[in-house]
């Protein structure tokens, strides 16, 4: 058996770190035995077999001339192996941030902090947080570790599915390349990493009749479940064009009529989205999208954008009610109840 | 059944050295931070030392820094203290404890200690 | 690392409640939010009651609440009751050396 130790990483190459002392060691004959060393190509011996050092071939202070291939003859001139030297460094621990798009699965990416110029891989796991009472100490319920699933294809991601809205977990990233392995640990919390993708479908329609109107609605963003637990507030903001302020209204569904609309002129609309108790962050904004308010009776003079607030809308000369707005109350079972378990 | 098991404890000379294990099991050792804490008799309790999950990062109590070694053996689920240098001053109850840490993106913080075990008593006395 | 201030002793009749003070530095206790008590009854080991300043883990009462304010941490026990009796300390992580620091301690005599 050969008397190198296999290091992590593809088979003949062996590593070590620049400005440090590199031990090489012959592979195809045993431990302690005599070997000559050559550079791969060149006939200059390096280190004889009166060395002192056996199979063993020592580089002090190697640098990036020293890397390549290297071969090991025995005392009989037979072939005792070929090796090849890498240098890098040591592993460092990754840097790791974990998000979260709905409440039950959230995910975590990493990247290394310094690279180490080796063959790398990522070790990844997560493991549920419990602080044990005194009398709950005998009897430590399953909390893990359970293994990070990574992507395929080499994305530096793992996800975790089926997580507890109100657990914390910590998560396990070990940097490993063949001079060691180095973790980042992370406590993530959903609450606190929530960020819902932004509201899908916007439309922003006029109302007819109404100039100074639009009516703009949205959907839940498909990564939200589709029965959810618990549900999602929104904000919208909407400005005419050439206006650089944007106005904020928090609608109480997914549909919000704009009154104080500049009639004549196209507005952008956005909406965000945030977990319905405050947990976590606001989205980002979804693109805009636009609508201009219908041609109706318009007022005699468009106010100055200072007044939009207070300037009363014109109400068509038809004797029409205004189009009225649909409920949107969440239906009784999808009402929030949060008990903290 | 969570449980730590400390061992090691006994006479020594002032001046002399003694090496403390503690035991963990039923629960993952390696992912958890790990502590020693002491208590002299009739006293309070006095934090002596620290140690991250992997053992690569370690804290001491000015009382006993360059005297006392906080290590781990993650494949044997055991904690461990080298003490040299021992003083009557360091005569107590030695605990092992675990603690859950709080891991931020930069940094891991000492938390709290949620399992103790039964203690060891170290005894400095000529 | 200095030790946290606690008063030496603290006492109330069953049913009452009783509050015991922690008081740090802006390195310790004012500047984190890792302080945690702990109860010791006669030759046992301590048992955590409370963590991360007010949190209480799985299987203690909810008598035992804890609070802070700037550098000073209080545990108040309400309903108190014979069991009670004991010594308690409070922690903290010290900011330094990956360090933590004990309270001095608090002996509480359940009266009658």
């Known amino acids: 058996s050969s008397p190198c130790p296999q290091a992590w990483g593809p088979p003949g190459v062996q590593y070590g770190q620049p400005g440090r002392s590199v031990k090489l060691c012959c592979p195809g004959v045993t431990a302690g035995d005599p070997v000559s060393w050559f550079r791969d190509g060149e006939p200059k011996l390096l280190q004889g077999p009166d060395s002192g050092l056996g199979h063993e071939l020592v580089l002090a202070q190697a640098d990036s001339t020293d890397e390549g291939t290297y071969i090991c003859q025995t005392l009989d001139g037979a072939l005792g192996g070929t090796v090849t030297l890498q240098l890098g460094y040591p592993p460092a621990r990754p840097v790791v941030s974990c998000q979260a798009a709905d409440y039950e699965n959230f995910s975590c990416t990493w990247s290394p902090s310094q690279i180490s110029g080796l063959p790398t891989r990522y070790l990844t796991s997560y493991r549920k947080k419990t602080v044990l009472g005194a009398d709950s100490q005998r009897r430590s319920p399953s909390t893990g570790p359970w293994p990070c699933p990574q992507d395929p294809l080499g994305a530096a991601r793992c996800v975790v599915h089926g997580a507890e809205f109100w657990s914390q977990y910590r998560i396990n990233v070990t940097e490993v390349n063949p001079l060691g392995a180095s973790t980042r640990l992370l406590d993530v919390s959903l609450q606190s990493i929530l960020r819902p993708d932004p509201p899908q479908g916007l439309r922003v329609e006029s109302v007819p009749g109404y100039p100074r109107r639009l009516r703009a609605s949205w959907t839940y963003p498909a990564s939200w479940p589709s029965q959810p637990h618990f549900l999602l507030k929104f904000r919208l903001q909407y400005r005419p064009a050439q206006h650089p302020a944007w106005s904020t209204v928090e609608p109480a569904g997914l549909e919000e009529v704009i009154t104080d609309a500049v009639a004549g002129l196209p507005h952008a609309v956005r909406v965000s989205a945030r977990d319905f108790l405050d947990a976590g962050t606001w989205s980002t904004w979804s693109p805009e999208a636009w609508g201009t308010p219908s041609t109706g009776t318009i007022p005699k003079e468009i106010p100055a954008w200072g007044q939009l607030h207070t300037q009363p809308e014109v109400e068509p000369q038809v004797d029409s009610p205004a189009p009225p707005r649909p409920s949107l109350q969440p239906h009784p079972r999808l009402l929030d109840h949060r008990d903290s378990v | 059944e969570v449980q730590l098991l400390e061992s090691g404890g006994g006479l020594v000379q002032p001046g002399g050295s003694l090496r403390l294990s503690c035991a963990a099991s039923?629960?993952?050792?390696?992912?958890?931070?790990m502590g020693w804490v002491r208590q002299a008799p009739g006293k309070g309790l006095e934090w002596v030392s620290y140690i991250y999950p992997s053992g690569g990062s370690t804290g001491y109590a000015d009382s006993v820094k360059g005297r006392f070694t906080i290590s781990r053996d993650n494949s044997k689920n055991t904690l461990y203290l080298q003490m040299h240098s021992l003083r009557a001053e360091d005569t107590a109850v030695y605990y092992c404890a675990r603690d859950e840490g709080y891991c931020s993106s930069t940094s891991c913080y000492f938390d709290a200690f949620d399992i103790w075990g039964q203690g060891t008593m170290v005894t400095v006395s000529s | 690392q200095s030790a946290l201030t606690q008063p030496p002793s603290a006492s109330g009749s069953p049913g009452q409640s009783v509050a015991i003070s922690c008081t740090g530095t802006?390195?310790?206790?004012?500047?984190?939010?890792?302080v945690s008590w702990y109860q010791q009854h006669p030759g046992k080991a301590p048992k955590l009651l409370i963590y991360e300043v007010t949190k209480r883990p799985s299987g203690v009462p909810d008598r035992f609440s804890g609070s802070k304010a700037g550098n000073t941490a209080s545990l108040t026990v309400s309903g108190l009751q014979a069991e009670d009796e004991a010594d308690y300390y409070c922690s903290s992580y010290g900011g330094s050396n990956n360090a933590g620091v004990f309270g001095t301690g608090t002996k509480v005599t359940v009266l009658g």
């Open positions: 802006s390195s310790d206790v004012g500047g984190y939010n890792f």
């Open positions: 039923g629960f993952t050792f390696s992912w958890y931070f």
